[in-house]
């Protein structure tokens, strides 16, 4: 799309569940009619046309798909369609992974869940919500990132070695906050700044490790839009 013609962006982590939110403002008089509501979710992939599932041709339409700013887009297709009676249809390979919460739908929440989200799911999504006497829509762009934690130096460590853990997610903006923790038997224990732990943005520096430091270390990256990702790394320190 051209700059200045963007839909809201939703970030998700590859391999993790992703929620594509759609809770349009529904007039009070229509709330009682939500059981008859129908919703169709459409996906326009970022690149590489989706393979049409047999018996599920791509949605009809002109497919002009020639944006003002770049070449032809992959054809859009129906991810999931839920009719007034709860009758569902959609693209077969996606079916087991895509979900609409039935109770949510009756409250006016038509969010689509991808369990899990995959790289090919990136792109523009549109939901058309059909109520008894009006039609509403939701639009968003799903971007997928990869989360990783790296150790420098990598591999097993010896007592008194130093290590830097770097927590990252492939997203252009910086996280608003980074929280480090250790997984103990009783749950998560926050890692605080100390002579043994030096925190700097998404880095954690351990100047002198000991066998006590062996085990899972984690970080939580939180972004301004509320998206957060939790990443784990198993540290091995040899006695």
């Amino acid at each position: 799309l051209q700059p200045g013609a963007e839909v809201p962006v939703v970030w998700a982590q590859e391999g993790a569940p992703a929620q594509l939110p759609c809770s349009p403002t529904i007039p009070l008089q229509d709330l009682s009619l939500l059981r008859r509501a129908g919703v169709t979710w459409q996906h326009q992939p970022d690149s590489g046309p989706p393979a049409a599932a047999p018996g599920h041709p791509l949605a009809p339409g002109p497919h002009p798909a020639a944006p003002s700013s770049w070449g032809p887009r992959p054809r859009r297709y129906t991810v999931l369609s839920v009719g007034p009676g709860g009758l569902r249809s959609g693209r077969l390979p996606l079916q087991p992974r895509v979900q609409l919460d039935e109770r949510g739908r009756q409250r006016g929440d038509f969010s689509l869940w991808l369990r899990p989200a995959r790289r090919a799911d990136a792109g523009e999504y549109r939901a058309a919500v059909h109520l008894r006497d009006r039609a509403l829509s939701c639009r968003l762009r799903l971007r997928l990132g990869q989360a990783s934690m790296t150790a420098s130096p990598p591999g097993s460590l010896r007592a008194s070695d130093w290590v830097i853990l770097n927590c990252s997610f492939s997203r252009p903006d910086r996280p608003a906050s980074v929280h480090w923790f250790r997984n103990r038997g009783q749950g998560r224990v926050p890692v605080r700044e100390s002579p043994h732990h030096h925190l700097a943005e998404s880095f954690l520096f351990l100047p002198q490790v000991s066998p006590m430091d062996s085990g899972p270390w984690g970080c939580i990256l939180t972004y301004r839009d509320g998206f957060n990702v939790s990443i784990m790394y198993n540290l091995t320190v040899l006695g």
Partner: antibody, heavy 120, light 107 residues
Framework: QVQLVESGGGLVKPGGSLRLSCAAS????????MSWVRQAPGKRLEWVAY????????YYADTVKGRFTISRDDAKNSLYLQMNSLRAEDTAMYYC?????????????WGQGALVTVSS | DIQMTQSPSSVSTSVGDRVTITCKAS??????VAWYQQKPGKAPKLLIY???YRYTGVPSRFSGSGSGTDFTFTISSVQPEDFATYYC?????????FGQGTKLEIK
Amino acid sequence: QVQLVESGGGLVKPGGSLRLSCAASGFTFSSYAMSWVRQAPGKRLEWVAYVTSGGDYIYYADTVKGRFTISRDDAKNSLYLQMNSLRAEDTAMYYCTRVAYDYEWYFDVWGQGALVTVSS
Amino acid sequence: DIQMTQSPSSVSTSVGDRVTITCKASQDVTTAVAWYQQKPGKAPKLLIYSASYRYTGVPSRFSGSGSGTDFTFTISSVQPEDFATYYCQQHDSSPWTFGQGTKLEIK
């Protein structure tokens, strides 16, 4: 080629009725949502009525609700607009339009229009 | 209902000029705006949909941009056949509404 041809327009007295027809050709009519859009002389375009491809959902503009009825006959590749209790303000050119998708509500194909004049 | 307010209502221009028309929605419609061209005595023709996507066969001199409530339609170099009236339409939610139109006239 893709074509929509309206018929049934004409002069009618206030309170009278008229039925517009739209014959579709050059595309799979049953796969598309359809709509009627009108334009009073010298005025902006005004959406009037809409029907989904399967006919599950039908919507009307408040100005025509209860007086106009949209219907489709997929076997005949035809769209209809039954207009009852016509008023002077219903005077307009009525366009049969194809909706790009059931879920994307812009109008990608238009007929040439049928003129409806409501006058005593 | 979502109101669409177009400006200016008319614009006088010459062949080769760049022309910009704006459309303001009364509430957020994300990128659900289409632009149409209508010549006297003819039906409208779809030019742009979803704010910035050119419809099949539409020349590249026509472009659109915007999101939320503010949208722009541009003809980069006006041609003789472009003198017509242009309408914006929101295709976000029913009732689907149009702007009042902008008449492009020869200077």
